[in-house]
């Protein structure tokens, strides 16, 4: 029996990320006897729920059950039946639901109530549905990428498990972009913070981390676009908005009621002499960039240094992983390579935005027009946010790594959330006993 493998005791966990634009279900697995080790949990499945984010179901809550069915059934298939009852299920809702809660706490609770009712019908061990805070979203994203990069492991390796790993224990900062909010989280050089609201302290695997984090509500890519449109329509002379952030020849009618539906546009709201207006694309990166910059108030800063809107931001430190929409957008634009300089990215964006809409549609025939039409804005917004918002420079640009997956697991807050809620990140370094990790007898 020298090399006979013992049957491994595998555990599973499910986290639903209820984002502003869509919901994704993630299934994680890990060997039960190693659950306090770093880097042993990995993602086995991502299931994207068909339809919009859960906050859009506020007037049709009875449809939430059907909406979640396919992905929950997929989880039933992937996870062995013998493990169903033991498998924890968590749902975390992010900025889309934060915005709904700002409008009506009662309506937000109604949505979560129906979510619980729906998820309780499955054989898994449902733990709860809640709206996570922006601070949590930032912190858990930071934990996820550093866990997957092996930054919490005390064992130094002579080899690199992932391309970005520099084989040191310096943690990566986390840059997360969603539809309705964006988060920046990193360990600054200076341990003292001028803004306690932005300070988090962790003890993970026997080491203390003083982390800076901030979540900018309304500065996710979709809400930023609504903000920009609401700002620009204020000065339009008629119901035509010539917009540099859309390709030349692109046309779209927008309802003013849709524009002012979100709390994110309240500061730009005014009575307009029309109910609808038409966006006409003119495809000019430079003008689009200027328009986006007007969303960032940099004139006021009560600290030594700010990002924008008077929010403290310490000097940037170390490497950063940029994930979620930072990655999806830059990957679509083919700009995720480490070799592409910031100047080159800007150059490519200028070229992309100026391409006629008809040409774009032909080149990307398989892409939904709604998404396709917004890549010029989204790419420009990402550049503006990183450079002017967070003060990255042409030099520090090379410290940004656009990451989709690490070791097969998606970068994002969900893994960190599950690790925390299942107590799988010990404060102290676990003592490894000689036989505790033996799989062979």
């Amino acid at each position: 029996t020298q090399n006979k493998a013992l049957p491994e005791n595998i555990k599973y966990g499910i986290v639903l990320d209820a984002g502003s634009s869509h919901t994704s279900l993630y299934i994680y697995k890990w060997p039960a006897e190693k659950e306090n080790d770093t880097g042993v949990v990995h993602q086995v499945e991502e299931c994207r729920v068909k339809g919009p984010g859960i906050s859009k179901y506020v007037q049709k809550v009875n449809e939430i059950g059907i909406y979640l069915t396919d992905c929950m059934e997929r989880a039933r298939e992937v996870i062995p039946r013998s493990q169903h009852q033991e498998t924890p299920v968590y749902l975390g809702a992010t900025a889309g639901m934060r915005l709904l809660r700002m409008e009506s706490e009662e309506l937000a609770d109604r949505v979560l109530d129906v979510v619980e009712r729906s998820l309780s019908n499955y054989p898994f061990d449902f733990q709860g549905a809640r709206i996570i805070t922006g601070q949590e979203e930032g912190a858990y994203g930071w934990i996820t990428i550093n866990y997957l990069l092996g930054k919490f492991s005390q064992k130094t390796r002579w080899f690199s498990i992932v391309p970005y790993e520099t084989n040191n224990q310096e943690t990566f900062g986390a840059l997360d972009l969603g539809g309705a909010s964006t988060q920046i989280t990193f360990v600054p050089q200076n341990q003292t913070t001028e803004s306690p609201d932005n300070a988090l302290q962790f003890r993970l695997y026997g080491k203390d981390y003083n982390v800076y984090t901030h979540s900018f509500l309304c500065y996710g890519k979709d809400q930023a676009l609504w903000q920009k449109l609401a700002k620009d329509i204020q000065v339009a002379s008629n119901e035509i908005l010539r917009d540099p952030c859309f390709h030349p020849g692109y046309k779209k009618v927008v309802n003013v009621s849709d524009l002012y539906k979100t709390p994110c546009t309240k500061r730009f709201e005014m009575t307009l002499p029309f109910q609808q207006f038409e966006i006409q694309g003119i495809g000019n990166y430079q003008q689009c960039h200027q328009s986006v910059l007007e969303l960032f108030n940099t004139s006021y800063c009560p600290y030594s240094q700010c990002a924008f809107n008077g929010i403290f931001l310490p000097p940037l430190q170390g490497d950063f992983g940029a994930f979620s929409a930072f990655y999806f957008v830059m990957n679509f634009l083919n700009l995720t390579s480490e070799k592409v300089s910031q100047e080159k990215v800007t150059e490519m964006m200028k070229k992309f935005c100026s391409q006629p809409w008809e040409e774009i549609k032909t080149s990307y025939a398989g892409v939904k027009e709604k998404y396709l039409s917004e890549y010029c804005f989204s790419g420009t917004y990402i550049l503006s946010l990183l450079l002017q918002g967070y003060h990255f420079t042409a030099d520090s640009w090379e410290h940004i790594h656009f990451i989709g997956k690490i070791q097969g697991s998606d970068a994002g807050w969900t893994l960190g959330y599950m690790l925390n809620l299942t107590n799988m990140i010990p404060a102290e370094q676990p003592l490894s006993t000689p036989l505790s990790h033996s799989t062979y007898v």
Partner: nanobody, 126 residues
Framework: EVQLLESGGGLVQPGGSLRLSCAVS????????MSWFRQAPGKGLEFVTA????????HYADSVKGRFTISRDNSKNTVYLQMNSLRAEDTAVYYC???????????????????WGQGTQVTVSS
């Protein structure tokens, strides 16, 4: 951390009814599964019932099934235990408990991080 305050205990005759309340302050109430445990004189702590954050999942100990009902009112940040057909063996100190993002099933196993109330005495006697 949440704080819990039980009320409604007292002396009741066998076959009678009693309704316990547990008011929760601090924290977002719907994020907590709530539970009732009890401790009879000279005995260990016993699970009675638990309910999920929005009330769709409940668990009961076999000894109270069909007689006790747990419910919650999230607008009042309160969980209730309706006790009917009370018996002498239901005499105990009843403790309210809260666990954040933890299933009622795990509360039943006393797993996870649980916050406890100070308890309310229920005496069933003729």
């Amino acid at each position: 951390e949440v704080q819990l305050l039980e009320s409604g205990g007292g002396l009741v005759q066998p076959g009678g009814s009693l309704r316990l309340s547990c008011a929760v302050s601090r924290g977002t109430f719907s994020e907590y599964s709530m539970s009732w445990f009890r401790q009879a004189p000279g005995k260990g702590l016993e699970f009675v019932t638990a309910i999920s954050g929005f009330g769709h999942i409940t668990h009961y100990a076999d000894s109270v099934k069909g007689r006790f009902t747990i419910s919650r009112d999230n607008s009042k940040n309160t969980v209730y235990l309706q006790m009917n057909s009370l018996r002498a063996e239901d005499t105990a100190v009843y403790y309210c408990a809260a666990a954040w993002q933890t299933s009622p099933r795990r509360m039943m196993q006393m797993a996870g991080s649980i916050t406890w109330g100070q308890g309310t005495q229920v005496t069933v006697s003729s």
